[in-house]
């Protein structure tokens, strides 16, 4: 049965329209030639930045060996969408597929890959390529996790107290401070799946004059600093 390799290969490139594009196609180790009738399913968790293009790949099997190629797409709150190509008749068929941004990369008889143009939060879900051969099926599944970069702000709201916010990130960002203070952190969950994290810190020690808020997120990290003034100071804002 097909077994996953330990190493994942993440390719990132720029397309002509300046939209970042990533493709996750991992090599698998075939450890036996005695194929079982239903071959092992390989699943990959894949974080993808919002507003990029994504390409999802099928197992590496030449068209001459195939009967049907099917992409099954399960998105939250929607009926399962299937895109199928039947080699014998050279026909493609779609069932319950409404998102026009999810398409075959090209003609399925030339390339079985699936592409998502301009990934949105709604593309969070499970994508599976099923390759039907005369001796069983090969599967490749992707748990697609759409990442949203939070907007980071840092400001002083009262004497020796600073507030750092990571607004509308997905998943939730993690906020830490240098130096550590007396902190309280709150999370606010939005209906679109994003989370706002708010960390409020107070420093009693008067020799602390500058504090740094460090925001860790899957899309990248960001640090902002502020001087603790007797009165509220200038507001700092930045994207990761």
């Amino acid at each position: 049965a097909a077994q996953p390799n330990n190493s994942l290969m993440l390719q990132t490139s720029k397309e002509n329209h300046a939209l970042a594009s990533s493709s996750l196609c991992m090599d698998e180790k075939q450890i036996t030639q005695n194929y079982s009738k239903v071959l092992a399913e390989v699943n990959t968790s894949w974080p993808v930045k919002m507003a990029t293009n994504a390409v999802l790949c099928c197992p590496p099997i030449a068209l001459r060996n195939l009967i049907i190629i099917t992409w099954e797409i399960i998105l939250r709150g929607q009926p399962s969408c299937t895109k199928a190509y039947k080699k014998e008749t050279n026909e493609t068929k779609e069932t319950n597929c409404t998102d026009e941004r999810i398409t075959w990369v090209s003609r399925p008889d030339q390339n079985s890959d699936l592409q998502i143009r301009t990934v949105a939060i709604t593309h969070d879900g499970y994508y599976r390529c099923i390759m039907v051969t005369p001796d069983g099926n090969f599967h490749r599944g992707y748990h697609l996790q759409v990442l949203v970069t939070p907007e980071v702000t840092l400001f002083q709201n009262r004497n020796r107290t600073a507030v750092c916010k990571a607004v509308a990130g997905k998943p939730a960002a993690h906020i830490s401070w240098i130096p550590e203070g007396d902190c309280a952190t709150k999370q606010e969950y939005w209906s679109n799946g994003t989370v706002t994290v708010k960390s409020t810190c107070h420093w009693e020690v008067h020799n602390v004059s500058t504090v740094t808020c460090h925001v860790s997120h899957l899309t990248g990290n960001k640090s902002l600093y502020i001087e603790l003034l007797p009165v509220p100071g200038a507001k700092k804002s930045a994207k990761l």
Partner: antibody, heavy 119, light 110 residues
């Protein structure tokens, strides 16, 4: 285990035809594409074409089109490669090889059949 | 058709040393993140034997002394360390749609 057994050596005259057989065992015969490759004495490997026993699809190397025919007999799990209008340069060892699905690699080969074309 | 060019044509290596064979394709044999390039070993009077598939995957039962690398158009087969019974011809092959082999590299052990 998976095995491919080819027919014995042949000696043919120029202009004649030869039909080489490749009998498969140890797996579901109709499930895997079979390729034919030849190797002239002291030379490299040359792909001739393939047959898919599942649906009888064939695809031949342009070089051999019109001269080569690949067929299969599902009752005996055997594929055949027939080459016509033989010339001396067709003298070679002819191999059948089974294509495994994953990666389209050839993991199982026949032992080879020597075809000698001589007047 | 894709043309595969192997180099060198022949190679003499001492036991324990490294042998490197390269294969260059006239156009990319990689698609969907996979490189449909395989390496075979052929000893006199025997059919070829699969060593490496999809550029870098070791076929079951093949010693780890054999390794493959590369993508796109440039590929390498490495034998390290070489042993006496590695004397053979080595062929690269691509298998995406129409298939071709490299012309072969003869490896001799000194």
């Amino acid at each position: 285990q998976v095995q491919l057994v080819q027919s014995g050596a042949e000696v043919k005259k120029p202009g004649a035809s030869v039909k080489v057989s490749c009998k498969a065992s140890g797996y579901t015969f109709t499930s895997y594409v079979m390729h034919w490759v030849r190797q002239a004495p002291g030379q490299g490997l040359e792909w001739m074409g393939y047959i898919n026993p599942y649906n009888d699809d064939t695809n031949y190397n342009e070089k051999f089109k019109g001269r080569v025919t690949m067929t299969r007999d599902t009752s005996t799990s055997t594929v055949y490669m027939e080459l016509s209008s033989l010339r001396s340069e067709d003298t070679a060892v002819y191999y059948c090889a089974r294509e495994d699905y994953y990666g389209s690699r050839w993991g199982t080969w026949g032992q080879g059949t020597l075809v000698t074309v001589s007047s | 058709d894709i043309v595969l060019t192997q180099s060198p044509a022949s190679l003499a290596v001492s036991p324990g040393q490294r042998a490197t064979i390269t294969c260059r394709a006239s156009k990319s044999v990689s698609t969907s993140g996979y490189s449909y390039m395989h390496w075979y070993q052929q000893k006199p009077g025997q059919p070829p034997k699969l060593l490496i598939y999809l550029a870098s995957n070791l076929e079951s039962g093949v010693p780890a002394r054999f390794s493959g690398s590369g993508s796109g158009t440039d590929f390498t087969l490495t034998i390290n360390p070489v042993e006496a019974n590695d004397t053979a011809n080595y062929y690269c092959q691509h298998s995406r749609e129409l298939l071709t082999f490299g012309q072969g590299t003869k490896v001799e052990i000194k």
